[in-house]
């Protein structure tokens, strides 16, 4: 149903039935003995989407997910029994839920699962070349998964595998109390965050991990973790959640006398995503749900997109906030949070900060220390007691780029595509929800790049039954979006241009960067094809200018088009 209305009303709202009828969705409805299709790994080179699920790992063809291979990786009956004996649910907990699926090298993936509350990891052979058609479990090589996968399938792991080392934020114990950021695998001793210290991590829920270079020197590379956690006592009145960004240096090998095999460069800062509310009290979106990094020409400065929801049960809302890495770095170079005063409240640390500044990576760029093991004792002592920054990271423009508060759903996932249109580049967001719908939203700059207008292009129901979308990937090569849920997978093209209507005006008014009027129909826009007959106006959506004569066929038709 085509609707040309306010920005918060989708131009196109498509039910699951309409998506099927227009060949706009391909679904994989899961296997009878599996579920939880939550762990995605996109391989554009091989044209595969690897998916970790309950007791299975899948390799889907990106062209059509109906074409797939599968590995069955259940737990032994003995592990299942032990899990059951521990009072866990045989279906929902006493199975192997795959939580980590990463490229290990050119020929293998690394996978970890909950192993029925007994985390386990192994390698998956995928061959040298796509045509090898190899997809098999290395069942002679199992490894302990503690500190890599959680025990409990309800928990997530944020992980990153680089240079043969696995960085993971997860729960490292049966009870789900010992949360930590680990580095395992590789040749070095495993490293983790300080244990039983709520200043470091306070019952966190990890979202994702990313390597972001700090300079042209790879020694300065940092790994950033995104998570949400309980606010530390005194930081907030009452129990509250805070969204966080944490950093660690890739070349952190722990301390020498103190913080041995613990991170010495761990710092965290709060991510703010809020709107001014009545009575001068801001409405905060604190429950970070997902993060997407949009790479720019400068690899040091990707744009961070975050999806947030409210903590309140009374007021349900979702928001998308954008952050710049320069703002993040500014906060990490700012004052540390310190407890002081009669009420032992958090204040900016005013004293002498030891040299080299805690959080700085040991390298030639920022000082003469070759290793964190060489750091002076006062640096280590300070780092141990000051893991948090005082200043929060505010979003670009100090406000969300999109908010939804008057709807019966919440945002869960986000992926973003940078699209070349006739009148410039646009970021198109695909936002997954907890009811199985995907929103397609375009950010349109107004006067300045920082001032954005959000246009909700489409709202698509991609699963038959309402089900939370728990994973999303976008293939720029295939021009397809993939969504995972407890029940299965959905694949959809990034555009449905024909659905906007059969007139130039409707196509133009849609303001979809993927679509343009080609003289006969609203069809996919290819930037390379510089045909004079392509009508498109994303910035203004003005059909009068673009659809009048000038070689453009098609009648001016302002009537809404219904299917």
């Amino acid at each position: 149903n085509y609707q040309n209305g306010k920005n918060n009303v989708p131009r196109l709202k498509l039910s699951y039935k309409e998506m099927l009828e227009s060949n706009s969705v391909i679904t994989f409805n899961g296997l009878a003995n599996s579920s939880s299709y939550h762990t995605f790994l996109l391989d554009e080179e091989r044209s595969r989407l690897y998916v970790g699920a309950k007791d299975h790992i899948f390799s889907f063809n990106l062209v059509n997910i109906k074409d797939f291979q599968k590995i069955v990786w259940p737990v032994s009956y003995t592990r299942r029994d032990e899990c059951k004996w521990a009072g866990k649910d045989i279906q929902k907990e006493c199975a192997n839920f795959i939580k980590v699926l990463k490229a290990y090298n050119q020929t293998h993936l690394y996978a970890c699962g909950t192993g029925a509350f007994h985390p386990i990891c192994t390698y998956i052979e995928i061959g040298h070349h796509p045509e090898d058609n190899i997809f098999k479990l290395e069942d002679s090589h199992f490894e302990n998964g503690r500190g890599k996968s959680p025990y409990d399938p309800k928990l997530l792991t944020a992980s990153l595998l680089i240079d043969g080392e696995l960085y993971s934020g997860t729960a490292a114990d049966f009870m789900g109390r010992d949360f930590a950021i680990f580095r395992t695998l590789g040749h070095h001793h495993p490293i983790r965050t300080e244990q039983h210290d709520s200043r470091w991590l306070n019952d966190p829920r990890f979202i994702s991990a990313h390597l972001i270079p700090e300079s042209d020197n790879p020694e300065d590379d940092k790994v950033y973790f995104f998570f949400r956690e309980n606010a530390i006592d005194g930081e907030h009145t009452g129990k509250a959640t805070h969204a966080r960004i944490g950093q660690i240096c890739k070349n952190d090998f722990g301390g020498h006398r103190s913080l041995v095999n613990k991170w010495t460069t761990f710092l965290k800062a709060r991510l703010i995503c809020s709107v001014p509310g009545p009575n001068g009290i801001d409405t905060h979106f604190d429950e970070l749900q997902d993060v997407f990094l949009m790479n720019s020409k400068d690899p040091k400065n990707p744009i961070v997109y975050g999806v947030f929801t409210t903590s309140s049960n009374i007021f349900k809302g979702s928001a998308v906030c954008m952050y710049s890495m320069s703002d993040v770095r500014r906060v990490f170079l700012g004052p540390y949070a310190h407890r002081d005063g009669p009420n032992y409240q958090w204040v900016p640390y005013q004293g002498r900060v030891p040299y080299p500044r805690p959080g700085t990576c040991p390298s030639k760029t920022f000082g003469g220390f070759d290793s964190t093991k060489d750091l002076p004792d006062d640096v280590i002592t300070f780092a141990r007691s000051h893991p948090a920054m005082y200043n929060p990271v505010f979003p670009i423009n100090n406000r969300p780029i999109m908010i939804k508060t008057d709807v019966n759903y919440q945002f869960t996932q986000i992926v973003v595509d940078r699209v070349d249109a006739e009148d410039g580049q646009y970021d198109v967001m695909f936002i997954g929800t907890d009811v199985g719908t995907v929103l397609k939203v375009v950010s349109i700059p107004k006067e300045t790049w920082h001032d954005l207008e959000e246009v909700l292009l489409e709202e698509m129901t991609v699963f038959r039954e309402p089900t939370p979308i728990s994973a999303m990937e976008l293939s720029t090569k295939q021009h397809q979006l993939y969504a995972g849920s407890p029940a299965g997978l959905a694949q959809l093209p990034l555009q449905r241009c024909a659905a906007y209507g059969r007139a130039c005006a409707e196509c133009c008014l849609a303001r979809d960067p993927y679509c343009a009027w080609d003289g006969a129909a609203c069809s996919r826009y290819f930037p390379a094809a510089k045909a004079r007959t392509r009508a498109q106006d994303i910035r203004n959506g003005d059909p009068l200018t673009h659809c009048s004569d000038g070689g453009i066929e098609g009648r001016m038709d302002h009537h809404h088009h219904h299917h």
Epitope: T78, R79, D81, E82, W85, G87, D173, F174, M175
Partner: antibody
């Protein structure tokens, strides 16, 4: 070859305490749940307690709950049973058993005699 | 009083087939795997059957296990004198959150 060797048994007065140990070898101790099972003289087997491979979960039979504590030290490949407030009915041979969905390996047992 | 019920004794002559029963409820045998243990005189118990009917390596195929509903049974065919021992069935009990054993069956090989 899997081996389980119990020690620490002996004669103790009612109300007294005893700590049993079980040294394990021949398998990756830290990968398996472990258990204690006892057998009173001339009687059948009675499960006492079990502990998860990483100590994350512990279970006890009602007859010993609150008095016995199971623990393990994975770095020493050793299982323990701390027995407090012992009663005459706790007199038995105490076996340490490797748990693998069932008790697939047993030690030879250590005798605990509680006298009044 | 054991949660699982076994006959206190059973007997047979060499070469004969003997069956030992084990009766329980839905919270143990009905919904959980049954194991059988053999205890030779003066020794520790040994696992004989696991997961209702599976034999660990080294256990002769003369021993077999089966389960139906809330009852299980152990069959020994081609009885031999060295089979003389106490036999226990066992299973996890979901409602008790503990492992339960039968009272044991003393098998005597006659003649």
């Amino acid at each position: 070859e899997v081996q389980l060797l119990e020690s620490g048994g002996g004669l103790v007065q009612t109300g007294g305490s005893l700590r049993l140990s079980c040294a394990a070898s021949g398998f990756t101790f830290s990968d398996y749940a472990m258990s204690w099972v006892r057998q009173a003289p001339g009687k059948g087997l009675e499960w006492v307690s079990w502990i998860y491979y990483d100590s994350g979960s512990k279970y006890y039979a009602d007859s010993v709950k609150g008095r016995f504590t199971i623990s393990r030290d994975n770095s020493k490949n050793t299982l323990y049973l701390q027995m407090n407030s012992l009663r005459a009915e706790d007199t038995a041979v105490y076996y340490c058993a490797k748990l693998n969905g069932d008790f697939d390996y047993w030690g030879q047992g250590t005798l605990v005699t509680v006298s009044s | 009083q054991s949660v699982l019920t076994q006959p206190p004794s059973a007997s047979g002559t060499p070469g004969q087939r003997v069956t030992i029963s084990c009766s329980g409820s839905s919270s143990n045998i009905g919904n959980n795997d049954v194991s059988w243990y053999q205890q030779l005189p003066g020794t520790a118990p040994k696992l004989l059957i696991y997961a209702d009917s599976h034999r660990p390596s080294g256990v002769p195929d003369r021993f077999s296990g089966s389960k139906s509903g809330t009852s299980a049974s152990l069959a020994i065919s081609g009885l031999r004198s060295e089979d003389e021992a106490d036999y226990y069935c066992g299973a996890w009990d979901s409602s008790l959150s503990g492992y339960v054993f039968g009272g044991g069956t003393k098998l005597t090989v006659l003649g």
